[in-house]
């Protein structure tokens, strides 16, 4: 997260760290007792490493009573996701067992009504992604509030030049932005999960390259079918 601040500890009990061989790789969001939603491209970066999900964490390194690392029973990328595009960049991870719920571990309601969030709405994005252009990684969860940007502006030639489909949404990126390592994390508007940070090599913090988020409402049928 660029231009953000440290989150209040455990105030986002849905927040997950998707880890490979014990290292944070991507963000994720607990959407059901045994399921974490993340970004499909995160799996590509995992190679053949052991994928696990950390729940109940604020600090990645310090012991915390609520922290628990779960093995992944099943990884389900969206069937239409492709390595060379950010389209359909969603991944569902089934935990090896149901998460132990509590004040620091709780699923987040996700948007099912397929309607665009009003541009200008302030939404919260959180993650353990880099906090500087130099690539500094935080130990504790960071967050930032970002205004939603209308799709027509996001699709301008100076911005993402037509790459933003109806199944994506954008948020402003003027110094405050999601960045590398935040992919798969939640964009939360009004207490509801609206978007998932897409993974990719997008420049961060540049106002002309807004953050791109996969709209979960557009994938309600797929999410329901996997969770069923």
């Amino acid at each position: 997260i660029l231009g953000g601040r440290e989150a209040e500890a455990h105030a986002r009990p849905y927040m997950a760290s998707v880890q490979v061989n014990g290292e944070h790789l991507c963000g994720g969001v607990l959407v059901a007792e045994q399921w974490v939603l993340s970004a499909a491209h995160c799996l590509e970066d995992a190679a053949d490493g052991k994928v696990q999900v950390l729940l109940g964490a604020h600090s990645l390194s310090q012991p915390e009573p609520s922290k628990r690392l779960y093995d992944v029973l099943r990884a389900v990328p969206h069937p239409d996701s492709r390595p060379d595009t950010i389209d359909h960049d969603l991944l569902l991870l089934q935990l090896s067992e149901k998460a132990t719920l509590g004040p620091a571990v709780r699923p987040l309601p996700w948007q099912r009504v397929d309607r665009d969030v009003e541009p200008g709405t302030l939404c919260d994005v959180a993650g353990w992604g880099i906090v500087s252009h130099a690539g500094r990684r935080p130990d504790r969860l960071q967050h930032v509030l970002l205004p939603v940007l209308d799709r027509a502006t996001c699709n301008r030639r100076t911005h993402h030049d037509g790459a933003i489909t109806q199944r994506m949404m954008c948020a402003e990126s003027n110094r405050r932005d999601s960045c590398k390592g935040d992919s798969g994390g939640p964009l939360v508007c009004g207490g509801v999960l609206e978007g998932v940070v897409t993974s990719g090599s997008r420049v961060c913090g540049n106002r002309k390259k807004p953050g791109i988020y996969t709209r979960v409402a557009s994938y309600a049928a797929w999410i329901d079918s996997v969770l069923a």
């Epitope: 541009p119 027509a152 502006t153 699709n155 030639r157 100076t158 911005h159 030049d161 037509g162 109806q166």
Partner: antibody
Framework: EVQLVQSGAEVKKPGASVKVSCKAS????????MYWVRQAPGQGLEWIGE????????NFNEKFKSRATLTVDTSTSTAYLELSSLRSEDTAVYYC????????WGQGTLVTVSS | DIQMTQSPSSLSASVGDRVTITCKAS??????VAWFQQKPGKAPKGLIR???SRYSGVPSRFSGSGSGTDFTLTISSLQPEDFATYYC?????????FGQGTKVEIK
């Protein structure tokens, strides 16, 4: 298939107004700005302005700001350019074009201003 | 306003020739430059965006380069269908502006 289909040729008298339409199909109309360009006979291309069909926000070339009005009808996916106080030098082909992604342009509308 | 000065204004060339058209911006426009081809009585057709990225379906003989203030469109081997007028456009700043055009004619 993306298409921008413009209204037919117009002949107007000096001082009158003209309204040119541009009907979009094959994509989500509100997801892309629409801009307008004109080309006088034998001349180059001149940007008039643009409109965000989602919000209605507009940006204009200062030269046209006082005389040009850009509007949209999202229910019919149509963009409009209205130019008022026409003079002979406004005789030109007027084009609409989608801003972003592939460079889609309308076929052009010839507006002739003559007394 | 940013002026886009295109040169030459016209040129004569033969099929198979390598043709280079330049465009100079009066101030820095990063890589926010597009190139268009226009044939008589037709709407302009996009060739290049972001100074060097070809639009889909555009033959590989067309290439663009440059950043800042100096930009080039190159046709590596001119084909009969390439005889047309070419325009550069900057979209970095309002108002968007075009070069005055380069007419490529048959020698």
């Amino acid at each position: 298939e993306v298409q921008l289909v413009q209204s037919g040729a117009e002949v107007k008298k000096p001082g009158a107004s003209v309204k040119v339409s541009c009907k979009a199909s094959g994509y989500t109309f509100t997801s892309y700005y629409m801009y307008w360009v004109r080309q006088a006979p034998g001349q180059g291309l001149e940007w008039i302005g643009e409109i965000n069909p989602y919000s209605g926000d507009t940006n204009f070339n200062e030269k046209f700001k006082s005389r040009a009005t850009l509007t949209v009808d999202t229910s019919t996916s149509t963009a409009y350019l209205e130019l008022s106080s026409l003079r002979s030098e406004d005789t030109a082909v007027y084009y609409c074009a989608r801003e972003g992604g592939f460079a889609y342009w309308g076929q052009g509308t010839l507006v002739t201003v003559s007394s | 306003d940013i002026q886009m000065t295109q040169s030459p204004s016209s040129l004569s060339a033969s099929v198979g020739d390598r043709v280079t058209i330049t465009c100079k911006a009066s101030q820095n426009v990063d890589t926010d430059v597009a190139w268009f081809q226009q044939k008589p009585g037709k709407a302009p057709k996009g060739l290049i965006r972001s100074a060097s990225s070809r639009y889909s379906g555009v033959p590989s003989r067309f290439s663009g380069s440059g950043s800042g203030t100096d930009f080039t469109l190159t046709i590596s081997s001119l084909q009969p269908e390439d005889f047309a007028t070419y325009y550069c456009q900057q979209y970095n700043n309002y108002p968007l502006t075009f070069g005055q055009g380069t007419k490529v004619e048959i020698k």
